[in-house]
């Protein structure tokens, strides 16, 4: 489900613009957090800080928690480490497209997309290609806008993420997220 009919233009949580703004805030915060945990100075990630409201802060915490869990999945880390970043755009869009290729959308896959973007950003930092950072963030938001926006609107905006991961079994969902990303990377490697 991409964009269904005309997108609402108001300022509510399901307006196109609000979803994109919140998505950009969450992505930026998530990537900055992942980079900070590596311990390295990353002035390239010192993007304009935007004040977060209480709802966005909760969402950011939720994403951090899932990110930490995914970091401890060794199979996933091995797969990501093996990604050839000579053509990062092709890798990103192939993996992203594959994650949603069956037409089934859920918050787990949205988080997997953010996580994969963060790993590509960290690779860019390690390989001293800082100009790629904003580019990768841009690709992620482009993909979100063109493929996921309508679905996020149908979930009532980003707050749907909290209810999805707010269950006692959120670790189980995180295992599913890792599986989605691992499967997509496997397919990409076979195609490559």
């Amino acid at each position: 489900m991409d964009g269904s009919g005309e997108q609402p233009r108001g300022g509510g949580p399901t307006s196109s613009e609000q979803i994109m703004k919140t998505g950009a805030l969450l992505l930026q915060g998530f990537i900055q957090d992942r980079a900070g945990r590596m311990g390295g100075e990353a002035p390239e990630l010192a993007l304009d800080p935007v004040p977060q409201d209480a709802s966005t802060k909760k969402l950011s915490e939720c994403l951090k928690r899932i990110g930490d869990e995914l970091d401890s999945n060794m199979e996933l880390q091995r797969m990501i480490a093996a990604v050839d970043t000579d053509s990062p755009r092709e890798v990103f869009f192939r993996v992203a497209a594959d994650m949603f290729s069956d037409g089934n959308f859920n918050w787990g896959r949205v988080v997997a997309l953010f996580y994969f973007a963060s790993k590509l950003v960290l690779k860019a930092l390690c390989t001293k290609v800082p100009e790629l950072i904003r580019t990768i963030m841009g690709w992620t938001l482009d993909f979100l806008r063109e493929r996921l926006l309508g679905w996020i609107q149908d979930q009532g905006g980003w707050d749907g993420l909290l209810s999805y991961f707010g269950t006692p079994t959120w670790q189980t969902v995180t295992i599913f997220v890792a599986g989605v990303l691992t499967a997509s990377l496997t397919i990409w490697k076979k195609m490559g």
Partner: antibody, heavy 119, light 109 residues
Framework: EVQLVESGGGLVQPGGSLRLSCAAS????????MHWVRQAPGKGLEWVAS????????SYADSVKGRFTISADTSKNTAYLQMNSLRAEDTAVYYC???FGYGWAFDYWGQGTLVTVSS | DIQMTQSPSSLSASVGDRVTITCRAS??????VAWYQQKPGKAPKLLIY???SLYSGVPSRFSGSRSGTDFTLTISSLQPEDFATYYC???????????FGQGTKVEIK
């Protein structure tokens, strides 16, 4: 109401330059992607260039790479196409279009501006 | 780059006919395929996005489908206002390397 209005077309000699503008209204271009598509007289549509103003990420068709530059000024809500080293084969109607939420389909288009490259 | 081969390049049909236009991708693509209608001297208009989703305000006689690398636009019952040129467009080869099909002119028989 969403609107895209192109301007800047005209007659230019081979090797010359021209700058096209696309003024957007009814939406904010910041989180959109903006595109230029051209159509030579009696021919089909050809994608020229795209920009995502949020990240300033740009992409170009091979036929214009190194000669054309797409840019955006979010404060003016306007996208631009700077065309240098123009050739006769660049003669076309140039359309500005946006994509926003429809799988990279272009949901709104401008009326087009004619660029004629001739001596 | 991915090429989109559109067929036929032109066709003649009568009002009420069922019309089918096909675009074949040169390699496997995702469903990021759109269809447009263009009339002389006018900008194209979006009909179908994501291979099979009908854009807002487009009559339901237009539909899109996908089978592997083949994408099809179908007009179930051709109306007088449907005589125009139709284009497919893909952006699946690593956005935004976008390509259009060559176009199909639908003329009155």
């Amino acid at each position: 109401e969403v609107q895209l209005v192109e301007s800047g077309g005209g007659l230019v000699q081979p090797g010359g330059s021209l700058r096209l503008s696309c003024a957007a209204s009814g939406f904010n271009i910041y989180y959109s992607s903006m595109h230029w598509v051209r159509q030579a007289p009696g021919k089909g549509l050809e994608w020229v260039a795209s920009i995502s103003p949020y990240s300033s990420y740009t992409s170009y068709a091979d036929s214009v790479k190194g000669r054309f530059t797409i840019s955006a000024d979010t404060s003016k809500n306007t996208a631009y196409l700077q065309m240098n080293s123009l050739r006769a084969e660049d003669t076309a109607v140039y359309y500005c279009a946006r994509s926003f939420g429809y799988g990279w389909a272009f949901d709104y288009w401008g009326q087009g501006t004619l660029v004629t490259v001739s001596s | 780059d991915i090429q989109m081969t559109q067929s036929p390049s032109s066709l003649s049909a009568s009002v009420g006919d069922r019309v089918t236009i096909t675009c074949r991708a040169s390699q496997s693509v995702s469903s990021a395929v759109a269809w447009y209608q263009q009339k002389p001297g006018k900008a194209p208009k979006l009909l179908i996005y994501s291979a099979s989703s009908l854009y807002s305000g487009v009559p339901s006689r237009f539909s899109g489908s996908r089978s592997g690398t083949d994408f099809t636009l179908t007009i179930s019952s051709l109306q007088p206002e449907d005589f125009a040129t139709y284009y497919c467009q893909q952006s699946a080869g690593g956005y935004p390397l976008i390509t259009f099909g060559q176009g199909t002119k639908v003329e009155i028989k």
